[in-house]
């Protein structure tokens, strides 16, 4: 399996939320002995391996907002802690996950990684990632929605969300 | 992979007006904000102001206010500077240079334009 | 406007040896608790390069002999073991707020 960025670049106008997406693509085993771990974590520009550094999310690691659930099962992170951050990571069972931010500030611009682990128990791990960067910009010529960039785009073509 | 390339240098007379192009690729360019930077013959850096191609929307350095303008196209994903009412003073590289808010820096320079006034 | 005042204008430094570079900004620049100074190099005939941005993080394809500190108002540059290909002037900016100014550049030459 892959993962796909439907979009590599979300600009936004602070105090918006904006949510996150990676898609899990190709053949998915649903065997019992089969598990899927999802997160999400920030990392560094300009690295030679893209996603190869993992920083916390809103002092939050890749640990915490972690996913861990079936084949193509629908789930979502613990309530609690992810929501005093203003974050939520969810799955869906057509492998999409997400993690949804709220209230952006600045400090949130920069470089997002989905990590996808397929863990086959008593077998070794396959793990995959997807990148895309989040621009929180401010200004009074900062758009008042989001706007984000299909990865197929190189330039100009964008979708202003709602 | 990021390239910025701006236009030839230019000679212009005193009073005249100066544009100045760049033209970004390998990105999303209403993406990003572009900045404008000149630097006089042996001397520093100068912030001029900065355009939005989002939107067109632009902040400018008052010491340039009333002489500077900045434009996009995003159909050919370029930008450009005018620069009116040209004095000797004016005689500087211009650079465009791409901001990124993650860090608030600019990330990528175009290589430079000169241009000369000179009677 | 925030001025940046650059110190020492010009930098005699042996090859192999560590440089120091400061800048004291005329007013605080930090947002979001974050101090938002940044480092420029520039080589003779070319344009300016990121080293540093947000007082400590280096762009990319930056060696890690150089580094950044500081907070507030006061900031330093630094290189660990100054290299041939290190010549050039070096400026700070602030992207605290507009107009977005600079250092008046330092010169590093290898004496």
């Known amino acids: 399996f892959k993962v796909a960025t439907p979009y590599s670049l979300y600009v936004c106008p602070e105090g918006q939320n904006v949510t996150l997406t990676c898609r899990l693509l190709g053949p998915v085993d649903k065997g019992h002995d089969v598990t899927f771990y999802k997160t999400w974590y920030r990392s560094s520009r300009g690295e030679v391996q893209t996603c190869s550094e993992r920083r916390p999310i809103r002092n939050l690691t890749f640990q915490d907002l972690h996913l861990h659930h079936g084949g193509h099962q629908a789930a979502n992170t613990s309530h609690d802690l992810a929501q005093r951050h203003g974050l939520e990571s969810a799955s869906d069972h057509h492998g999409n996950f997400s993690i949804t931010m709220r209230n952006l500030t600045l400090l949130d611009s920069g470089l997002y990684c989905c990590l996808v682990v397929e863990i086959r128990h008593h077998h070794s791990e396959h793990r995959v990632h997807g990148a895309m960067e989040l621009q929180v910009q401010t200004g009074k010529d900062a758009p008042s929605n989001c706007v984000v960039y299909p990865s197929s785009s190189q330039d100009s073509e964008n979708i202003t969300a709602a | 992979q990021v390239q910025l390339v701006q236009s030839g240098a230019e000679v212009k007379k005193p009073g005249a007006s100066v544009k100045v192009s760049c033209k970004a690729s390998?990105?999303?360019?209403?993406?990003?904000?572009m900045h404008w930077v000149r630097q006089a013959p042996g001397q520093g850096l100068e912030w001029m102001g900065r355009?939005?191609?989002?939107?067109?929307?632009?902040v400018y350095n008052q010491n340039f206010n009333d002489r500077v303008t900045m434009t996009r196209d995003t159909s050919t994903s370029t930008v450009y500077m005018e620069l009116s009412s040209l004095r000797s003073e004016d005689t500087a590289v211009y650079y465009c240079?791409?901001?990124?808010?993650?860090?608030?820096?600019?990330?990528?320079w175009g290589q430079g334009t000169t241009v000369t006034v000179s009677s | 406007d925030v001025v940046m005042t650059q110190s020492p204008l010009s930098l005699p430094v042996t090859l192999g040896q560590p440089a120091s570079i400061s800048c004291r900004a005329s007013?605080?620049?930090?947002?979001?608790?974050?101090?938002?100074m940044n480092w420029f190099q520039q080589r003779p005939g070319q344009s300016p390069r990121r080293l540093i941005y947000?007082?400590?993080n280096q762009g990319s394809g930056v060696p890690d002999r150089f580094s950044g500190s500081g907070s507030g108002t006061d900031f330093t540059l630094k290189i660990s073991r100054v290299e041939a290909e290190d010549v050039g002037v070096y400026y700070c900016?602030?992207?605290?707020?507009?107009?977005?100014?600079f250092g008046q550049g330092t010169k590093l030459e290898i004496k």
């Open positions: 947000a007082t400590s």
């Open positions: 240079a791409r901001w990124t808010f993650d860090g608030l820096f600019m990330d990528y």
């Open positions: 007013e605080n620049v930090d947002k979001y608790g974050i101090s938002f």
């Open positions: 355009i939005n191609p989002y939107n067109g929307g632009t």
């Open positions: 390998g990105y999303p360019f209403t993406g990003y904000f």
């Open positions: 900016q602030q992207s605290k707020e507009d107009p977005y100014t």
